[in-house]
Structure formats: structure tokens, C-alpha cells
Interface confidence: low
């Protein structure tokens, strides 16, 4: 009988998330390793065969870019090992037995967001990597607007905004006059509870897009009669 | 504390099979995942094959095809049944054991597998 040796508790935590097409960003929280150890994590594909990426850590963070052929799938799934070298050997940890990208999720930030303003309405629209084309219908955002001199904490939110690059504000919900600026960020859609698990997506939002400034249109409301028209 | 039990190490001819199993027992209610490493002499220690609780497995690109990693939940027990070995898996053989959430891992004292040609 052999007694294992225990190699905790660990004080690391490891965080990695997908852009869910050629990149994994992670970050970890770890006592210092010391000088001259250059730790890494091997991501070794349950999939692919030759589906192994290294990740170099540099400080807390390391990102892995996966080549094109690679790009991520549903089905993806990895085993993650945690390697430094101590003493001159070699030490490896084991950090999740089944990484599943879809689970961990955060987007690119839509891009390119434009303004096209008409008589009583503005039209916003963004663009998309075009590897999530696919999943267009799977895309929820959050968009967030002020005038240009208030903060950010004080914008209005739209949400809910479902399988669309573009969407309208109407000229009542501006004040007129004032130049606004309007940013997105995006998330997988939460599904359904009858889609099947392989088809499930779990993450957080991207960042916010760049933001886009734009005058507000004038409100085209009634004619207003002038007092003692019948 | 976990105790790991190996057994099904020795000398083997190319091309022959060999089955390693590792028990494991004591602190084990919260076991996540149970797989195996090998180190070569002057090589780094490398991923063999790791199976989860859910019974998801992972096996190295060197060895898919060759080796199967198997879980028993009922006796905590991993298995790698080692098919058409080569001289090249030669190396000691080391169980390994996670604890959910990563907290605690431990691993095994290694078991030799030799492979003649």
C-alpha cells in the first residue's frame, strides 16, 4: 500500500475563457513561484489528435491562440495541466480533467458599431466575427446609451436584444439636441431547458465595444394646434 | 489523507498488453478525477490519461488508440489496460488522484512498466 502525497491544498485558482473560435485567455491567483521557473499550462485535447496548446503564463495571465484548423466546436473538451519546474524537476498539476470551452464563454466585443441617423429614429448597427456567423440566432446583447457628457453609470439599457446586428432607438427615447454615445457587449443566449447539453453555452459578457457618438434625431411628434382653434 | 494502492507494473514485450490499476481509499468522498502520468528516464512527467467523475476520458495523442483508461466508482479504483506497448512507454507510471475543485491532488509512489523490443 502506497500513500499518495498530497500536493495541497493549492492556493492557485485558475480561470480560463474562449472567445469561442481560435482564442483561450486565462488568469490565475498563485503564491510566487520564485525566480527562473517559467510555469505554463498544456491543454490536451480529448478531440483532436495532436490537440495539445501550451500556455505560457506571463505573470498571472497567458493566452492561448489556437491555429485555424483547430477552431473551437461544441463537442471541444480538454484536459488542463498545470507544469513549473522546481528544484530543476519538473512539477505538474493536474487543473481541470474536462475543460469545456462552451461552458466558459466570453466573447470578442462586437465590433464596428455605427450610427445612421434619420428623421425620428437612429439605426445602430455592428458586425460580428464572421466564424460566429453560425451562431448569429445564439448571440444576445446588451446595449447601453447617454448623452455624451453624462457617465456611464447613468446610461439606459437595452437588453434582451436576441439574433440581430443592428436595432433601432427611437427619437423619444434621446434628448433632442444632444449629442449621444451608445456601446454593446455581447453574450451566448441562455437556452431553453430542453436544448441538448452539447448544445449548451455558459459564460459572461464581453467587454464593452467601442462606443459610437451621435447627434439625436428631432422627435417628429403631432402639430401642435395653435390655443383657440376650436 | 488518500491512500493509493498501484499494482500491474514489470517487464513487457513490444507489442504485448499490460493492465495497471491504482485503488484508492480514506479521504475519497469528494474525488473528482483519477488518472494516470509517466515519466521517462531524463523526460519530463507527461499526461498518460485522465478520466472525470462523469466518466469523461482523455488520453495523450501518444497513446490513443493503445491505452484505455476505465474507473470502477464502486471500488475507487482507475485501470489503464496498456495494448501494442512500444519500448517508447517505457517509464514509471504514476496514479494520480484530484479532489473536486482542484483543492487536493495526490499521487501515487510509481509503478515501472519496461518494455523490451
Known amino acids: 500500500s502506497v500513500t499518495g502525497e498530497g500536493q495541497g491544498p493549492r492556493s492557485r485558482t485558475f480561470t480560463c475563457l474562449t472567445n469561442n473560435i481560435l482564442r483561450i485567455d486565462c488568469h490565475w491567483s498563485a503564491p510566487e513561484l520564485g525566480q527562473g521557473s517559467s510555469p505554463w499550462l498544456l491543454f490536451t485535447s480529448n478531440q483532436a489528435p495532436g490537440g495539445t496548446h501550451k500556455c505560457i503564463l506571463r505573470g498571472s495571465e497567458c493566452t492561448v491562440v489556437l491555429p485555424p484548423e483547430a477552431v473551437l466546436v461544441p463537442s471541444d473538451n480538454f484536459t488542463i495541466t498545470f507544469h513549473h519546474c522546481m528544484s530543476g524537476r519538473e512539477q505538474v498539476s493536474l487543473v481541470d480533467p474536462e475543460y469545456l470551452p462552451r461552458r466558459h464563454v466570453k466573447l470578442d466585443p462586437p465590433s464596428d458599431l455605427q450610427s445612421n441617423i434619420s428623421s425620428g429614429h437612429c439605426i445602430l448597427t455592428w458586425s460580428i466575427s464572421p466564424a460566429l456567423e453560425p451562431m448569429t440566432t445564439l448571440l444576445s446583447y446588451e446595449l447601453a446609451f447617454k448623452k455624451q457628457e453624462e457617465a456611464w453609470e447613468q446610461a439606459q439599457h437595452r437588453d434582451h436584444i436576441v439574433g440581430v446586428t443592428w436595432l433601432i432607438l427611437e427619437a423619444f427615447e434621446l434628448d433632442p439636441g444632444f449629442i449621444h454615445e451608445a456601446r454593446l457587449r455581447v453574450q451566448m443566449a441562455t437556452l431553453e431547458d430542453d436544448v441538448v447539453e452539447e448544445e449548451r453555452y455558459t459564460g459572461q459578457w464581453s467587454e464593452w465595444s467601442q462606443p459610437v457618438c451621435f447627434q439625436a434625431p428631432q422627435r417628429q411628434g403631432p402639430l401642435i394646434p395653435p390655443w383657440g382653434w376650436p | 489523507q488518500v491512500q493509493l494502492q498501484e499494482s500491474g507494473g514489470g517487464l513487457v514485450q513490444a507489442g504485448g498488453s499490460l493492465r495497471l490499476s491504482c485503488a484508492a481509499s480514506g479521504s475519497i468522498f469528494s474525488i473528482n478525477a483519477m488518472g494516470w502520468f509517466r515519466q521517462a528516464p531524463g523526460k519530463q512527467r507527461e499526461l498518460v490519461a485522465v478520466?472525470?467523475?462523469?466518466?469523461?476520458?482523455n488520453h495523450a495523442d501518444s497513446v490513443k488508440g493503445r491505452f484505455t483508461i476505465s474507473r470502477d466508482n464502486a471500488k475507487n479504483t482507475v485501470y489503464l489496460q496498456m495494448n501494442s506497448v512500444k519500448p517508447e512507454d517505457t517509464a514509471v507510471y504514476y496514479c494520480?488522484?484530484?479532489?473536486?475543485?482542484?483543492?487536493?491532488?495526490?499521487w501515487g509512489q510509481g509503478t515501472q512498466v519496461t518494455v523490451s523490443s
Open positions: 478520466i472525470s467523475s462523469g466518466g469523461s476520458t
Open positions: 494520480l488522484v484530484a479532489t473536486r475543485g482542484g483543492t487536493y491532488e495526490y
